[in-house]
């Protein structure tokens, strides 16, 4: 199967319209949400088929997985099918919403277990909360699928913030049916060690006063044992431990570490296992692209968040123009680096009402005694346009002229427009774009400058106006990407007297 | 503390239907969902639908729509799923369940038999 465009994560603009095609050499098929969605199916001259499927007017609520399947009657052997996932950021849609079967999770046993709260942004932070308490919970979150983990048998909300709004998502409730009498739980120290760190198990059974402890573990299987220590938590009625610790662990440490416990008066059993990573030596990895060019907008505030990986944790500076920055204490700026997992980073610069001043190279640099990494990127600050002069002058020449002066960043376009029958416009009358015909009647002028200081660019148009025989009601539009602004004014002929 | 007392076991003949009953006692979650879930033997536990305390809201997961009713006596607050035009399939245990927020609360659990 060839999927166009190959994906696997697509993140499309709302309002927009994309074409997805997919080809094999039997028969395929779109699907989305178990149903296949109106597509165009055609047979190429060579056999090859193919599928195509137009999204249309996209929303956040188109955000999900897409499937390319085999839909072949003669059934071939395969079950081979292409996924792609499409993020459509849409700041009006929150959650995606659930079924009602994906807000209750029902479980028999302590296991992995998925709480679907999915946005439309993959660049949202997401966090996970029990309902009833505000501290985030330390569980990874993957934006196409939620939040995975061992979960309590808790209600629990999922939270983002989109532009200055906290969402919350509809509650998830956990149901865990306590089937068998043995209730074991596995936890490490640190899931991720050096070489030459310690590795340190703790397997946890509840509930049992005779139980029997079994690990398996890497070491074993090249018959190099290691003996556990059990120990009774006197605090917790029937809490017993096993403790497996390695020591100077070593890279075929790696590995599927199980506990296995037996309770032999009801013959019931239970384990579970946890993985253990042995690194050579400490990392630092950027998780995600942050764009070498970024913008705020003058007097609003912009956070700037960089992910990363690390192992053993790092220290996180952020320079600009090469100088430390540092909390101000005037709350300007704050920084942050959150621990989100046991080896995930969410470092955050905050600028607080960004001033022009504040534009600049930033950097941020996370490192340890075994590595380091940076990311820097340019922040542009995007000022408003404003219209700061238009007037309007009678040269000897008989022409008239009218000059429109404003600045901004990025650089303003100028649009000059006129509207000759003073009482009609511009409500009835669509007013006359000006300067971008060739006709005569109108030359324009125009010159940019960027001002270093204000980092800010300055238009100055002039219109000339070889005859003007009415008054005339001529508007400057200055225009950029964070605003607009508009100026009018009027032209009266030479022969009428001075308005 | 919230008690969930269900009906004794059912067997019944293909095509039949059951009427499982939950009572509730300790019961103050008035705002909160009675759930019923099934398993059949060596399966997973599978989510058949929900009833809110006062019976006038339920839904029911789409496999078994057209097929099960909840309902709700408030005065003796009992709750009842019933499973219409049973199949072999249906042999599971069918256990009632709500959440107090913190923690979830299960009923006992009635074995459904359906054999010819």
């Known amino acids: 199967l060839v999927v166009t465009p190959p994906g696997p994560e697509l993140v499309l603009n709302v309002s927009s319209t994309f074409v997805l095609t997919c080809s094999g050499s039997a028969p395929v098929v779109w699907e989305r949400m178990s149903q296949e969605p109106p597509q165009e199916m055609a047979k190429a001259q060579d056999g090859t088929f193919s599928s195509v499927l137009t999204l249309t007017n996209l929303t956040g609520l188109d955000t999900g997985e897409y499937f390319c399947t085999h839909n072949d009657s003669r059934g071939l052997e395969t079950d081979e099918r292409k996924r792609l996932y499409i993020f459509v950021p849409d700041p009006t849609v929150g959650f995606l919403p659930n079924d009602a079967e994906e807000l209750f999770i029902f479980l028999t046993e302590i296991t992995e277990i998925t709480i679907p709260c999915r946005v439309t942004d993959p660049q949202l932070v997401v966090t996970l909360h029990e309902k009833k308490g505000d501290v985030a919970l330390p569980v990874p979150y993957d934006h196409q699928r939620g939040f995975s983990g061992i979960f309590e048998d808790r209600s629990y909300i999922c939270k983002t913030t989109i532009g200055d709004r906290e969402v919350d998502s509809d509650a998830y409730y956990v149901y865990r049916l306590q089937v068998s009498s043995i209730n074991v739980s596995v936890n490490a120290v640190q899931t991720v060690v050096r070489q030459g760190e310690n590795i340190t198990l703790m397997c946890i059974v509840i509930g049992n006063e005779v139980v029997n402890f079994e690990w398996t573990y890497p070491r074993k299987e090249s018959g190099r044992l290691v003996e556990p220590v059990t120990d009774f938590l006197l605090d917790m009625p029937y809490h017993i431990r096993s403790i497996l610790h390695i020591p100077s662990a070593e890279l075929e440490d790696s590995g599927t570490y199980t506990c296995n416990v037996t309770e032999s008066v009801n013959d019931h059993q239970d384990e579970k296992a946890i993985n253990i990573t042995v690194v050579e030596s400490g990392y630092v990895r950027l998780l995600g692209e942050v764009g070498t060019l970024q913008f705020a907008e003058l007097h609003r505030s912009r956070t700037l968040q960089v992910v990363f990986e690390a192992y053993p944790p790092p220290t996180v500076l952020w320079f600009k123009d090469n100088r430390t920055l540092g909390d101000s204490s005037a709350g300007e700026i704050a920084l942050s680096t959150r621990n989100v997992s046991e080896t995930r980073y969410v470092s955050e610069l905050t600028l607080v009402r960004v001033k022009v001043a504040e534009a600049g190279h930033y950097t941020m640099r996370a490192f340890h005694e075994d590595a380091e990494v940076q990311l820097s990127f340019q922040l542009q600050i995007n000022v408003p346009v404003r219209v700061l002069e238009l007037s309007e002058s009678h040269p000897d020449s008989g022409e008239q002229t009218v000059r429109c002066r404003g600045r901004g960043m990025p650089q303003p376009n100028i649009i000059w427009s006129a509207c000759r029958d003073l009482k009609r416009c511009p409500r009835e009358l669509p007013p006359t774009l000006l300067g971008n015909s060739s006709e005569e009647e109108s030359q324009l002028e125009t010159n940019v400058t960027y001002w270093e200081e204000e980092q800010e660019f300055e238009v100055v148009s002039t219109l000339r106006l070889q005859h003007v025989d009415r008054p005339l009601s001529v508007r400057c539009t200055l225009r950029n990407a964070v605003g607009q602004d508009t100026q009018e004014v009027i032209v009266v002929p030479h022969s009428l007297p001075f308005k | 503390q919230v008690q969930l007392v269900q009906s004794g076991a059912e067997v019944k003949k293909p095509g039949a239907s059951v009427k499982v009953s939950c009572r509730a006692s300790?019961?103050?979650?008035?705002?909160?969902?009675m759930q019923w879930v099934r398993q059949v033997p060596g399966q997973r536990l599978e989510w058949v639908g929900l009833?809110?305390?006062?019976?006038?809201?339920?839904v029911y997961a789409p496999k078994f729509q057209g097929r099960v009713t909840m309902t709700t006596d408030t005065a003796t607050s009992t709750f009842y799923m019933e499973l219409f035009s049973l199949r072999s399939d249906d042999t599971a245990v069918y256990y009632c369940?709500?959440?107090?927020?913190?923690?979830?609360?299960w009923g006992q659990g009635t074995l459904v038999t359906v054999s010819s």
């Open positions: 009833s809110n305390p006062s019976g006038d809201y339920t």
């Open positions: 369940a709500t959440h107090g927020g913190d923690r979830s609360y």
């Open positions: 300790g019961y103050t979650f008035t705002n909160s969902f």
